[in-house]
Amino acid sequence: TLNSVLNSNAIKNLPPPLGGAAGHPGSAVSAAPGILYPGGNKYQTIDNYQPYPCAEDEECGTDEYCASPTRGGDAGVQICLACRKRRKRCMRHAMCCPGNYCKNGICVSSDQNHFRGEIEETITESFGNDHSTLDGYSRRTTLSSKMYHTKGQEGSVCLRSSDCASGLCCARHFWSKICKPVLKEGQVCTKHRRKGSHGLEIFQRCYCGEGLSCRIQKDHHQASNSSRLHTCQRH
């Protein structure tokens, strides 16, 4: 049920910080039904930690990248690792946390005006649109400059929330990331119990909009801890 999904708090317990929604560390991100783990193991907890196996960066969360957990380790065994903060060493853009990119082997802050056409990311066939719209097709390509001239509308592929138009955030959807609506008052959200605890939510929803926070719905106060419903509410 929706309640069981919302309150499962899927946690991978990878090295902190996993942060919140893309571009908004610590923000509450609502889990939609469909948090995907291999073998259908949907609700992992700290007590039941299993590293999330991956083949490429797109299969990891917005604040993670795919790599071997040991330096020079077996390339065949890769898991999702926490992204690297500013000034940390990197080999590619995906290794750096949101708001940063890899330059000369170091994660540096992304200047939003800086042309990022060189960033590699899985995007999809454009079907003639300025902003590539989603396709089941997965391919590595270089983003063209036109993708950064205008902000992405809902459904446009994105790298960061800053790529999306006002009122949208960049959230994971299947094996892509797209611009989705920021949550409005009354919409369901997930309040993660500890900072950095949000796992790989393949169907992320955005964080709560301005002036709203993710709190237990009033009429759910009496409910057990496992069935508390959180919604976006006025501060």
Partner: antibody, heavy 118, light 107 residues
Framework: EVQLLESGGGLVQPGGSLRLSCAAS????????VSWVRQAPGKGLEWVSS????????EYADSVKGRFTISRDNSKNTLYLQMNSLRAEDTAVYYC???????????WGQGTLVTVSS | DIQMTQSPSSLSASVGDRVTITCKAS??????LTWYQQKPGKAPKLLIY???TLQRGVPSRFSGSGSGTDFTLTISSLQPEDFATYYC?????????FGQGTKVEIK
């Protein structure tokens, strides 16, 4: 030409197992997510399971979770559905389908009939 | 789960008629809405994706509209080969869900 061809259906007793296969051709199979969708006789379409292009993650309908396993072998261009602990309500035509734009299912196989009956 | 409700469940129409089928989602799904046509004994065929984009090879008499929760499939001038069952499907989140179908029959 994109083609998906299911096989492995048949008559099985309740509690039994079957393994469905879906052979893909005419496109680069490893670049696409794929799904299984079923249709009980005279009924509508029901999504069963999905798998990502690399096979890195899977997802299942609640009705089959813990009993069915989706997998793929990209070197053989083949999708699989291992079905265990089959029930009468699993009786349906099973289709494999490829994800296309906006994650609609743009190409479907012809289907394979699974009948669960004693 | 997001519920998809189609209406009507069936309709009778004549060749040349304009036919409209509606699909309502129980929650916001943006434009993640696909329409399919299915004929007896055959696999479904994708007609429209992203709520309003016509799939290559599909006749232009088919059109789709809507966004968010309310969607429409329109056949501008019904042809003999269009008598079939039509399904909508959302792919905004899993479980992927289909409408119950609309059967278009000959009057």
């Amino acid at each position: 030409e994109v083609q998906l061809l299911e096989s492995g259906g048949g008559l099985v007793q309740p509690g039994g197992s079957l393994r469905l296969s879906c052979a893909a051709s005419g496109f680069t199979f490893s670049n696409y997510g794929v799904s299984w969708v079923r249709q009980a006789p005279g009924k509508g379409l029901e999504w069963v399971s999905s798998i990502s292009p690399s096979g890195g993650w899977t997802e299942y309908a609640d009705s089959v979770k813990g009993r069915f396993t989706i997998s793929r072998d990209n070197s053989k261009n083949t999708l699989y559905l291992q079905m265990n602990s089959l029930r009468a309500e699993d009786t349906a035509v099973y289709y494999c389908a490829r994800y296309g734009a906006y994650f609609g299912l743009d190409y479907w196989g012809q289907g394979t009939l699974v009948t669960v009956s004693s | 789960d997001i519920q998809m409700t189609q209406s009507p469940s069936s309709l009778s129409a004549s060749v040349g008629d304009r036919v409209t089928i509606t699909c309502k989602a129980s929650d916001h799904i943006g434009k993640f809405l696909t329409w399919y046509q299915q004929k007896p004994g055959k696999a479904p065929k994708l007609l429209i994706y992203a709520a309003s984009t016509l799939q290559r090879g599909v006749p232009s008499r088919f059109s789709g509209s809507g966004s968010g929760t309310d969607f429409t499939l329109t056949i501008s001038s019904l042809q003999p080969e269009d008598f079939a069952t039509y399904y909508c499907q959302q792919s905004y989140e899993t479980p992927l869900t289909f409408g119950q179908g609309t059967k278009v029959e000959i009057k």
